[in-house]
């Protein structure tokens, strides 16, 4: 019997019945054996067939076999219902053998030519599998020559058995207060030869509860308990299971908070699984009451373990803590039941006593003391002597604490002193320097430190002066004597102010002219305004039209008198404006050197001379009276002159104050 | 971690001013709370001067009422006392501290003296 | 004002001993007291607020009691380094007042 070729000899070639292509010999019995390599496969086909026909094949016939299974028997030129014949069929082995026998019986009725056939081995794909069968790999089969292999989906490994597809599903662990976990794919059919764990760990505190919901099935036995395929629950108290079957198991507290579950598949069956929602309890704490006057948010049937409420009051309440205040209150249920914070109280906001307004009083016009929300205080200022600066001094108690004013400002109103205010009536004609009397001038400053100067009081902390009067001191304003209230210079009665700072105006330059002659003193303290100590007005934009030539003005001072000594009483001295280029013209001649007066300074005076300012009125203020507001202001500072006081044809030489507006704005403003 | 941190002059004369400035960290002042001056005498005895809340509002002991100031430079997350007109009886060491006194800073130790 | 007082100035007593520090307040301050640890040249260290809320980190062995004007501080299992003085303090009303302090000390 041919033995056919063998792998790994090329396999493929011919077959023939012996004698072909001549008729056949009775008795004859051929066999052959091929063999292809493993993963391979025989084809075979016949281009000639020619055997007596016989019943059931009995006589003549070709007989292909694959292992213990015939694959065919042939007799024939053409298929019959009981016989065949292999036409155009190809004919495949079931591994990678294949046998073919041919006989012929002892006779025949006529001459046969017997059969020629051809084969070769082909690749198995081993991934097509017939319908109904199993299929090869549990997920992916991938065909190559000779072989094949299987991989699996994302989330499997292949098992070691190399074609089931085993479920990565251990080590999720499940950390929130509820959620849901099932079996791998559900619910399709669980995989095969798996081994799942799942974890619930909640702070401790937390119980776990089990709901087994939709459906149950998993791979059983109706003798022993869950053999196959199972699921296990295990807390740190006890075991759950093992549950397998249809049924739903019931509702499962496990009174833990940390939850294993185990699920265990074998090898075969085909089952939906499972599907757990679980949730947790803790032990609840004391239902929150709101404060009065406060609302509690969330509001819950229940608060347990990690919930948490805010507390929120009414618009003009607040959170207080005793008297503690609070922004926000928000209280956290902990593991014993109890609060992590006590409740706080929602109270009325209580703006507290208002602050005292400087040179002005309040009054409480919701009721004596009142100073809780919404209550309202009316702030007034001294009458006579000061007026409210901004708004109208009405103030309500609002929901932030604060006292705020109708314009929403939290700050106190200002009381600014009455400018300009003077006990004195002008006349119309000039006479000679006068005694002033109290009230006159309340303005006027005596400004000792070295020489005796003055100064005018502006607002209620500052001095206009002029800046040859305080030049030496300007470093070291502390030693300047500030004196105002009084009219007698020499008086022990006087109020006293002292300098915190001393500003000269920066285009002044000491010894070379009195360009720019003007300064500042800011005092240590507000001074207290009343009849005897009154700030003068600085001048409106319209003002010059109070200032024009022959206009008068006034002179005050303890400056020398006709008598050559200072004066020991207040005297002041009304005097005309001098027309700007006749004063110009009077200091053109020596010893003044050209350009003397400037268009910084202003003159007053006779030209007769006898009425004019003098050495101690320096720093003073030459004021008008505005007719349209009815209040003084200073339109000069008494600076320079002639040698000779009151002399004929000279005149008194005054900063012209309306020029430095800004400059005095600024300072003020800045410091 | 919240942290208040004093700072001051540690030496002031009598009838001068006292300023000293509190640093928080870790904190926002103007988030919550109330933020305290507290002083402790020779002698161990403590006494709470006042505070300013996360508002900017402010309460004071009322023995001090007419001496004490407490302001705050939210910008730089301090809060400030000023104290006017010392006497020997001020000496101590100032803590502040936040709300009920659940965070403190190590205190600044303040002496008037001539 | 309201005075915070603690009657006892010392209290002598031993590692591992169970024990109660009292505050009297003059009037109602409801439950706003807050209890401190002070040691020399140190801050006061906060232990308590509102009367019975232990502050976080503070161990277990630390126990505030009481509401209303009287109030106790208990320490159980007393340790070595508990061994300090005792503070108590009432927020409820304007000026906030501290007691003058207990000091425990070895027996």
């Known amino acids: 019997t041919p033995l056919g070729p063998k792998w790994p000899e090329p396999v493929f070639g011919r077959l023939a019945s012996p004698g072909f292509p001549g008729e056949y010999a009775n008795d004859q019995e051929r066999r052959w054996t091929l063999t292809a390599p493993p993963g391979y496969r025989l084809r075979l086909y016949f281009t000639h067939f020619d055997l007596e026909l016989s019943h059931l094949c009995e006589y003549d016939f070709v007989k292909l076999s694959s292992g213990a299974k015939v694959l065919a028997t042939l007799c024939g030129q053409e298929s019959t219902d009981t016989e065949r014949a292999p036409g155009k069929d190809t004919f495949y082995s079931l591994g990678s053998s294949l046998d073919i026998t041919f006989r012929s019986d002892y006779s025949n009725e006529k001459p046969f030519t017997g059969f020629e056939a051809f084969y070769a081995a082909e690749d198995i794909d081993e991934c097509q599998v017939a319908p109904g069968e199993a299929p090869t790999c549990d997920h992916h089969c991938h065909n190559h020559l000779g072989g094949f292999y299987c991989s699996c989906r994302a989330g499997y490994v292949l098992h070691r058995n190399k074609r089931t597809c085993s479920a990565l599903c251990s080590g999720q662990v499940f950390t929130q207060r509820s959620g849901e976990l099932s079996s791998p794919e559900y619910p399709r059919p669980y995989p095969k030869l798996s081994s799942c764990t799942y974890s619930i760990s909640l702070e401790e505190g937390f119980s776990v509860i089990l709901d087994f919901v939709e459906s149950f099935d998993v791979e059983t036995h109706p003798e022993t308990l869950c053999p196959y395929d199972f699921l296990k629950i295990q807390t740190d108290r006890e075991e759950h299971g093992p549950f397998c079957g249809k049924t739903l198991p019931h509702r499962i507290e496990t009174k833990s908070n940390t939850v294993t579950i185990t699920f265990v598949t074998d090898e075969s069956g085909d089952h939906t699984g499972w599907k757990i929602h679980y949730t947790s309890t803790a032990q609840p704490c004391p239902y929150p009451m709101a404060p009065p006057n406060g609302h509690v948010s969330p509001v819950q049937a229940k608060y347990i373990l990690k919930d948490s409420f805010s507390i929120f009051c009414e618009t003009g309440y607040e959170l207080l803590q005793g008297h503690l205040p609070l922004k926000s209150f928000t209280a956290v249920c902990q593991k014993d039941g109890s609060w992590d914070r006590p409740m706080p109280a929602c109270s009325i906001v209580d703006c507290g006593p208002p602050d005292d307004l400087p040179s002005g009083r309040v009054e409480y016009i919701t009721g004596p003391g009142v100073t809780t929300y919404k209550a309202v205080i009316q702030y007034s200022c001294e009458e006579t002597f000061y007026t409210m600066k901004v708004n109208d001094g009405k103030y309500v108690c609002e929901a932030d604490g604060f006292w705020t004013s109708s314009k929403g400002e939290k700050s106190l109103p200002v009381c600014e002193p009455v400018c300009g205010l003077s006990a004195r009536t002008t006349g119309g004609r000039i006479y000679g320097g006068q005694k002033a009397k109290p009230g006159d001038f309340p303005w006027q400053v005596l400004i000792l430190g070295g020489t005796t100067a003055a100064g005018a009081l502006l607002y209620d902390n500052w001095v206009l002066t002029a800046a040859h009067a305080v030049y030496e001191q300007k470093h070291d304003a502390s030693a300047l004597d500030i004196r105002m209230g009084t009219l007698k210079r020499l008086s022990p009665h006087y109020t006293q102010a002292w300098s915190e700072a001393v500003f000269i105006h920066e285009g002044y330059t000491h010894d070379a002219g009195f360009d720019n002659d003007i300064a500042l003193i800011k005092l240590n303290n507000k001074v207290v305004i009343n009849s005897n100590i009154t700030p003068i007005c600085l001048p409106r934009k319209e003002a010059e039209s109070f200032m024009r030539t022959d206009d008068i003005g006034t002179a005050s001072g303890w400056g020398l008198t006709q008598r050559g000594f200072l004066a020991r009483n207040l005297m002041y001295v009304d005097i005309p404006i001098v027309d700007h280029q006749k004063c110009t013209a009077a200091y053109e001649k020596p010893p003044y050197p050209r350009g003397s007066v400037t268009a910084n300074m202003l003159c007053a005076g006779l030209e007769s001379g006898g009425k004019d300012s003098c050495r101690g009125d320096s720093g003073g203020a030459l004021v008008f009276l505005d007719s349209e507001t009815e209040r003084w202001f200073v339109g000069g500072i008494v600076s320079w002159g002639s040698m000779n006081c009151g002399e004929a044809g000279q005149y008194g030489v005054y900063t012209k104050v309306i020029n430095y507006i800004p400059w005095i704005e600024n300072i003020i403003s800045d410091f | 971690e919240v942290q208040l941190q004093e700072s001051g002059p540690g030496l002031v004369k009598p009838s001068q001013s006292l300023s000293l400035t509190c640093s928080v960290t870790g904190y926002s002042i103007t988030s919550d709370y109330a933020w305290n001056w507290i002083r402790q005498f020779p002698g161990n005895k403590l006494e709470w001067m006042g505070y300013?809340?996360?508002?900017?509002?402010?309460s004071y002991n009322p023995s001090l009422k007419s001496r004490i100031s407490i302001t705050r430079d939210t910008s730089k997350n301090q809060f400030f006392l000023q104290l006017i007109s010392v006497t020997t009886e001020d000496t101590a060491t100032y803590y502040c501290a936040r709300y009920w006194g659940d965070y403190w800073g190590q205190g600044t130790t303040l002496t008037v003296s001539s | 004002d309201i005075v915070m007082t603690q009657s006892q100035k010392f209290i002598s007593t031993s590692i591992g001993d169970r024990v109660s520090v009292t505050c009297k307040a003059s009037?109602?301050?409801?439950?706003?007291v807050a209890w401190f640890q002070q040691r020399p040249g140190q801050s006061p260290k906060p232990l308590i607020y509102?009367?019975?809320f232990r502050h976080s980190g503070v161990p277990d062995r630390f126990t505030g009691s009481g509401s209303g004007t009287d109030f106790t501080l208990t320490i159980s299992n007393l340790q070595s380094e508990d061994l300090a003085e005792y503070v108590c303090?009432?927020?409820?009303?304007?000026?906030?007042?501290f007691g003058p302090g207990t000091k425990l000390e070895l027996k």
């Open positions: 009037q109602d301050v409801g439950g706003h």
């Open positions: 303090l009432q927020y409820n009303s304007n000026p906030l007042t």
């Open positions: 300013i809340s996360y508002s900017g509002r402010t």
């Open positions: 509102s009367a019975t």
